[in-house]
Interface confidence: low
């Protein structure tokens, strides 16, 4: 059987290294060897490249080496496949070396900001040594912020033959680290070089970008003053590296700027003590280059009626996220503030907040919250400068069984009845929403009985017990993950009711 006709011939000129062609099929059923016939020097010369018989393998590739690599030039290539049964020739293919030239990558040696020019980086590189001296090179510059996986690209050409080249990359973010890599190719070529080694540069710092500002209103004190915990953070979209030297706060009662108070701090939180009126609060951050735009917050008067527009809220878990969704009766509200913090018996150690715009849902990655911890999540509607009534819910990203069972005691022991009372498990030990309690009780040497009650019940009267009998009992608290038993208690039913005993004696 004759070998298959070589097809899909593809050639590439590795500048000053070799001229290599490949074809298909790569494998033949019987042993096949190949000859690649080339004409070069614009058709004036020809030669042959043979695949190596000694390896006894089918090589669907062959390379022509210097000094017969001529450039510029047009080559023709024809591949002959030969086996014991005969020869099969490919079609003749035509190759312009300028169009298939591949060169080495350039080498970036500098990525710097230029003093006084904002949001720009100047990239300097060395043209590849192995590149035609006089040809125009086209370039692709790839860049991304250091913590992003998404590359952006810009394409340009350079005609100069200096080996040091420069490109100014503009419209970047201020004070941000960028990663750069560069590739090049002769202008007419279809083959790009590999990418250069990555280099990192940082744009110049500017005055801070802006702040997100929020507050926690605390109950008024005995003297009538209201503690207000202010908190702020870099606005979403601020440069990653942005650092503030400090923050200026000023505040005053509405319509009375004469009573303006000012505070300077390096913290990102500050407690104010305000009167009962409406107040306006302003915060700016500053660095050596200037101030950020002002962040403004209105603190409502103590007796102000706040609007309510959230009708319902649900928290649900996906595989790796907690999603909170809410329904609102006010279509005009499109900004919401979400607060979340662990529901612990002590003061919460970590309080977090985030603004949501043009959505009625909020998501957080599960691994940003601690499993087995209950989180309080509140959503506040924000309409211009007014903050509405929050709607709150609780959620666990993962429930476990309680770390301890309920502490239980037996009261009002009778002949056939007993009242069992148990304490709620402390928040820190619940590890999930307690959905029910199960009372397990058993007479000595008797069958075990159980009774399950709702989680809001902390007392239960057992009836139809046997008189003058020892019982053991424990209460199990259950979450969705399972239950944990409290300590076992023992009691003995009476032989005769106290009531009956006294009555008898009286007669």
């Amino acid at each position: 059987v004759l070998p298959a006709k070589p097809e899909n011939i593809s050639c590439i000129f590795y500048y000053e290294e070799n001229f290599t062609c490949t074809w298909s099929p790569e494998k033949e059923a019987s042993y096949t060897w190949y000859k690649v016939k080339r004409t070069y020097s614009y058709g004036y010369k020809s030669d042959i490249c043979s695949t190596d018989n000694s390896t006894r393998g089918n090589h669907a590739s062959c390379s022509f080496l210097p000094p017969t690599i001529t450039n510029p030039d047009n080559y023709t290539i024809q591949v002959e496949a030969q086996n014991a049964d005969g020869i099969m020739k490919s079609d003749i293919t035509y190759w312009n070396l300028d169009a298939i030239m591949k060169i080495e990558p350039p080498e970036i040696f500098s990525v710097k900001s230029v003093l006084g020019i904002k949001r720009m980086l100047q990239i300097k590189w060395i043209r590849p040594v192995l590149a035609p001296h006089s040809s125009t090179l086209k370039y692709t510059l790839r860049f991304r912020t250091i913590n992003s996986a998404y590359w952006m690209e810009v394409n340009f050409t350079k005609e100069d033959i200096d080996r040091d080249e420069t490109y100014n990359l503009t419209e970047l973010q201020a004070f941000t680290e960028y990663v750069m890599t560069l590739r090049c190719a002769p202008a007419e070529s279809m083959f790009w070089s590999g990418w250069s080694q990555e280099k990192v540069g940082t744009t110049e710092e500017e005055a801070p970008y802006g702040l997100d500002l929020w507050r926690v209103l605390k109950p008024a004190m005995v003297d009538g003053r209201r503690p207000v915990q202010l908190m702020w953070k870099k606005a979403t979209g601020a440069p990653v590296l942005e650092k503030a030297l400090g923050y200026n706060i000023w505040y005053f009662p509405e319509n009375n700027t004469n009573l303006t108070e000012t505070v300077n701090t390096t913290n990102q939180t500050h407690e104010l003590y305000l009167g009962g009126k409406t107040y306006w609060v302003y915060v700016v951050s500053y660095n050596s280059l200037g101030e950020s735009p002002v962040a403004t917050l209105r603190i409502p008067a103590l007796n102000e009626k706040t609007f309510q527009c959230i009708e319902a809220m649900q928290a649900c878990l996906t595989q790796d996220q907690l999603v909170v969704e809410w329904q609102s009766s006010a279509p005009e509200v499109d900004t919401w503030m979400v607060e979340w913090f662990p529901d612990v018996d002590s003061e919460p150690s970590s309080f977090s907040w985030e603004s949501v715009s043009q959505a009625r849902n909020w998501t957080i990655q599960k691994d940003e919250l601690k499993p087995l911890w209950c989180y309080n999540i509140s959503v506040y509607p924000v309409l211009r400068d007014r903050v509405g009534q929050p709607y709150s819910t609780q959620a666990y990203v993962q429930e476990g069984i309680p770390s301890a069972g309920p502490v239980t005691q037996a009261d009002s022991i009778g002949v056939k009845t007993v009242t069992i009372t148990w304490k709620e498990i402390p928040k820190s030990k619940r590890n999930g929403f307690i959905k029910n309690y199960t009372i397990f009780y058993q007479a000595e040497d008797g069958k075990e009985f159980s009774k399950t009650v709702n989680s809001n019940i902390l007392q239960y009267r057992l009836e139809s017990l046997t008189r003058r009998t020892s019982y053991s009992l424990q209460v199990m608290a259950s979450t969705n993950a399972g239950g944990t038993n409290g300590t076992k208690i023992n009691f003995k039913t009476l032989s005769i009711s106290h009531h009956h005993h006294h009555h008898h004696h009286h007669h």
């Epitope: 599960k366 691994d367 601690k370 990203v397």
Partner: antibody, heavy 119, light 107 residues
Framework: EVQLVQSGAEVVKPGASVKVSCTAS????????IHWVRQRPGAGLDWIGR????????KYAPKFQGRATLTADTSTNTAYMQLSSLRAGDIAVYYC????????????WGTGTLVTVSS | DIVMTQTPLSLSVSPGETASISCKAS??????VTWFRQKPGQSPKLLIY???NRYTGVPDRFSGSGSGTDFTLRISTVEADDTGVYYC?????????FGQGTKLEIK
């Protein structure tokens, strides 16, 4: 990339203390527990204790109670283990490990720090 | 403390065979058992968690089973790269404890 990089090897005198650091990258230690485990030469693994960096709460194995002190600095995303009154039996590689609660496992281990006690 | 006892302490298996390592807890640890492998000079690497769940990227030749007090790690079609010391560990109750380790050699 999520990783825990520990401080370099230490040679200390008997009776002295050593403090090993464990710096996290790719995640916030406030959202996990950091545990410490030691491995004596040619021997198995021994749990020392754990810290919750969000609030500083610690739990120790009884045999290390009083000698080991676990701390964390969330601003630098670093956990520390200090072991005092060192003796020859404390020669070991000390590892920190991240405990992934959602599925209950140590999914990331530190690079290990060799502590040698020698006069 | 809960004691985790591994058997055997060393094991020599030919490539392609199955290796089994047993781990016994001194009291019930439900399914709170994790298996690790440690190669010389390296940190332990997670293989199996919650007794039977394979960690991301671990080949399905590795499987874990058991609950209560008896647990087993099985490596089917053993390969040369499977050498190392295998540890079980319980995180059911503090202090968390490890088995003594089983050294797996490939013949």
């Amino acid at each position: 990339e999520v990783q825990l990089v520990q401080s370099g090897a230490e040679v200390v005198k008997p009776g002295a203390s050593v403090k090993v650091s464990c710096t996290a990258s790719g995640f916030n230690i406030k959202n996990t527990f950091i545990h410490w485990v030691r491995q004596r030469p040619g021997a198995g693994l021994d749990w020392i204790g754990r810290i919750d960096p969000a609030n500083g709460n610690t739990k120790y194995a009884p045999k290390f109670q009083g000698r080991a002190t676990l701390t964390a600095d969330t601003s630098t995303n670093t956990a520390y283990m200090q072991l005092s009154s060192l003796r020859a039996g404390d020669i070991a590689v000390y590892y920190c490990a991240r405990y992934y609660y959602v599925s209950s496992y140590f999914d990331v281990w530190g690079t290990g720090t060799l502590v040698t006690v020698s006069s | 403390d809960i004691v985790m006892t591994q058997t055997p302490l060393s094991l020599s298996v030919s490539p392609g065979e199955t290796a089994s390592i047993s781990c016994k807890a001194s009291q019930s640890v439900t399914n709170d058992v994790t298996w690790f492998r440690q190669k010389p000079g390296q940190s332990p690497k997670l293989l199996i968690y919650s007794a039977s769940n394979r960690y991301t990227g671990v080949p399905d030749r590795f499987s874990g089973s058991g609950s209560g007090t008896d647990f087993t790690l099985r490596i089917s079609t053993v390969e040369a790269d499977d050498t190392g010391v295998y540890y079980c560990q319980q995180d059911y109750s503090s202090p968390w404890t490890f088995g003594q380790g089983t050294k797996l050699e490939i013949k």
